[in-house]
C-alpha cells in the first residue's frame, strides 16, 4: 500500500510491531494489521469488543474486494448477499433467498418461479412438441397383412420439458382406427413360431383366412372345408373391390 | 429505477470555473462510491475522480488534480464537482456515475465547452 | 497508469456475422476487466465485468474472455441493435483507465 501512509500510521501507533504477521506491511499488537503488503486486502474482524485488521489475498465470503490508490479494501455484501462481485451484483443470496437481476428476493417477481436447487428465479418453462410426425401403417396385432381394419399411431416429441409451474406436455402419440383393403399375407409374414398349423379363430368382425401352406399337405385333393374356404375367399375379394378403403396409410 | 441527473454544463472561458451537479434517485446514495468520467467529442472515455460513499476520502486523475473538487451532499443524494481554471482539453461530457469497481450507473451526460 | 490498448479502432460487420474485440493491458489485471457498451447519443451501459461475466439482460450472443493482459469481447450473430461502440476498462489498478474505443458499424 502507500508508504507514507504507513509512516502516518506508526506515528499514531506507539506500539507498532516490526515483525508483522503473514501479509501486513504495518501493524500494532493490538488491532492487528494497520496497512497490508501489495495486492492484499485488508478487513476487520470483530473478535469479542474489538476490530482487529486481517490481511489476505482474497475477501472473505460476504465480502467483495476494491482497490483504492491508498488501500484494497474488503467491502461487505448486502446483508442478504452470500457472494458479491459489489454492491450492485450478488453472484449468491444467503439461504432463504432467490437471486434475480443481482439482487436476492425472499419471493420471485410475477411470471417468474423459484429455482429451490439454484436458489435463482428463473424464467417459467412451458412444454413444447415437435409436430407430429406422420401416421404409422394400418397395423394389427403387429402385422401389416390379412385383416380389413386395424389401428394407426403417431407420435411426436417433447423439446421442452416444462418446470415446476409450467404447462404439461400434451399427449405425445395418437392412435385411430383405420380400414384398409385386405392383403393376403405371403409366405412367412404372419411369422408364427414353428410354422403351426393350427387355425386361429377369427375375430370379431374378420372372417376365416386359409393358411396357404403345401408343406405336410399329402394330395392335391381338396378336403369339403379347403373348397369353402376358397369360395369364401373369391366372395371377399368382390366385396373388397367394391369397398373403397378409408385408410390414410398405404399398406407396406 | 435508478436515476443520475446532471446539470450545470455549459460554454466557459479558459481559465473560468464551473460547477457541475448530479442529482440521484432510486438507490441509497449514501452507500455508494460515486465519480465523474468524461468523455471529449468522438473520444473515448476518461476517469476524473472518485468519492467514497461518506466523502471522507477523494481521488482524481492527475490532469485535474488541484483543479478539480469532487464533493457530495448525502443528505440531498447529490454529487458535485467544481472545476476551476479551466483548459480547453476540459471540453467534454461530463457524465456522473456510481463508481464500485466498474462504473454501473450512469447519467445522461452533461456538456462543458471550454473556448475563448 | 495502466495503458489499455483496444483494436480495431472500428470495424464494418454484416447482420448475423461474429466480430471480435481486442484489449491489452500494459500490465497483468488478472481478471478486473469490463466492457461498455454506447449506442450513439446515449451513456454507456456496463455489459460485463470480471472479463466474462454477463450483466443480466445482456443477449447470450456476447461474451468476454481472457487473462493477464490479453482481453477479448466477442459478438455472434450480430444484430443491428448491437451498432455501438465498446470499451474496455481495468479497474486492478487506479487510476481505472479505459481502451480508446471500436466503434461498430454495419456493412
Known amino acids: 500500500q502507500n508508504a507514507s501512509r504507513g509512516r502516518r500510521q506508526r506515528r499514531m501507533h506507539p506500539n507498532v510491531s516490526q515483525g508483522c504477521q503473514g501479509g501486513c506491511a504495518t501493524c500494532s499488537d493490538y488491532n492487528g494489521c494497520l496497512s497490508c503488503k501489495p495486492r492484499l486486502f485488508f478487513v476487520l474482524e470483530r473478535i469479542g469488543m474489538k476490530q482487529i485488521g486481517v490481511c489476505l489475498s482474497s475477501c472473505p465470503s460476504g465480502y467483495y474486494g476494491t482497490r483504492y490508490p491508498d488501500i484494497n479494501k474488503c467491502t461487505k455484501c448486502k446483508a442478504d448477499c452470500d457472494t458479491c462481485f459489489n454492491k450492485n451484483f450478488c453472484t449468491k443470496c444467503k439461504s432463504g433467498f432467490y437471486l434475480h437481476l443481482g439482487k436476492c428476493l425472499d419471493n420471485c417477481p410475477e411470471g417468474l418461479e423459484a429455482n429451490n436447487h439454484t436458489m435463482e428465479c428463473v424464467n417459467i418453462v412451458h412444454c413444447e412438441v415437435s409436430e407430429w410426425n406422420p401416421w404409422s401403417p394400418c397395423t394389427k396385432k403387429g402385422k401389416t397383412c390379412g385383416f380389413k381394419r386395424g389401428t394407426e399411431t403417431r407420435v411426436r416429441e417433447i423439446m421442452q420439458h416444462p418446470s415446476a409451474k409450467g404447462n404439461l406436455c400434451p399427449p405425445t402419440n395418437e392412435t385411430r382406427k383405420c380400414t384398409v383393403q385386405r392383403k393376403k399375407c405371403q409366405k412367412g409374414e404372419r411369422g408364427k413360431k414353428g410354422r403351426e398349423r393350427k387355425r386361429k379363430k377369427p375375430n370379431k368382425g374378420e372372417s376365416k383366412e386359409a393358411i396357404p401352406d403345401s408343406k405336410g399337405l399329402e394330395s392335391s385333393k381338396e378336403t369339403p372345408e379347403q373348397r369353402e374356404n376358397k369360395q369364401q375367399q373369391k366372395k371377399r375379394k368382390v366385396q373388397d373391390k367394391q369397398q373403397k378403403s378409408v385408410s390414410v396409410s398405404t399398406v407396406h | 429505477e435508478v436515476q443520475l441527473v446532471e446539470s450545470g454544463g455549459g460554454l466557459v472561458q479558459p481559465g473560468r470555473s464551473l460547477k457541475l451537479s448530479c442529482a440521484a434517485s432510486g438507490f441509497t446514495f449514501s452507500d455508494y462510491d460515486m465519480a465523474w468520467v468524461r468523455q471529449a467529442p468522438k473520444k473515448g472515455l476518461e476517469w476524473v475522480a472518485t468519492?467514497?460513499?461518506?466523502?471522507?476520502?477523494?481521488y482524481y486523475r492527475d490532469s485535474v488534480k488541484g483543479r478539480f473538487t469532487i464533493s457530495r451532499a448525502n443528505a440531498k443524494s447529490t454529487l458535485y464537482l467544481q472545476m476551476d481554471s479551466l483548459r480547453s482539453e476540459d471540453t467534454a461530457t461530463y457524465y456522473c456515475a456510481t463508481h464500485d469497481k466498474t462504473f454501473d450507473y450512469w447519467g445522461q451526460g452533461v456538456m462543458v465547452t471550454v473556448s475563448s | 497508469d495502466i495503458q489499455m490498448t483496444q483494436s480495431p479502432a472500428s470495424l464494418s460487420a454484416s447482420l448475423g456475422e461474429t466480430v471480435t474485440i481486442e484489449c491489452r493491458a500494459s500490465?497483468?489485471?488478472?481478471?478486473?476487466l469490463a466492457w461498455y457498451q454506447q449506442k450513439p447519443g446515449n451513456s454507456p451501459q456496463l455489459l460485463i465485468y470480471?472479463?466474462?461475466s454477463l450483466i443480466h439482460g445482456v443477449p447470450s450472443r456476447f461474451s468476454g474472455s481472457g487473462s493477464g493482459t490479453q482481453f477479448s469481447l466477442k459478438i455472434n450473430n450480430l444484430q443491428s441493435e448491437d451498432v455501438a461502440s465498446y470499451f474496455c476498462q481495468q479497474y486492478d489498478n487506479y487510476p481505472n483507465t479505459f481502451g480508446a474505443g471500436t466503434k461498430l458499424e454495419l456493412k
Open positions: 500490465e497483468d489485471i488478472y481478471s478486473d
Open positions: 468519492i467514497i460513499y461518506d466523502g471522507s476520502r477523494t
Open positions: 470480471d472479463v466474462n
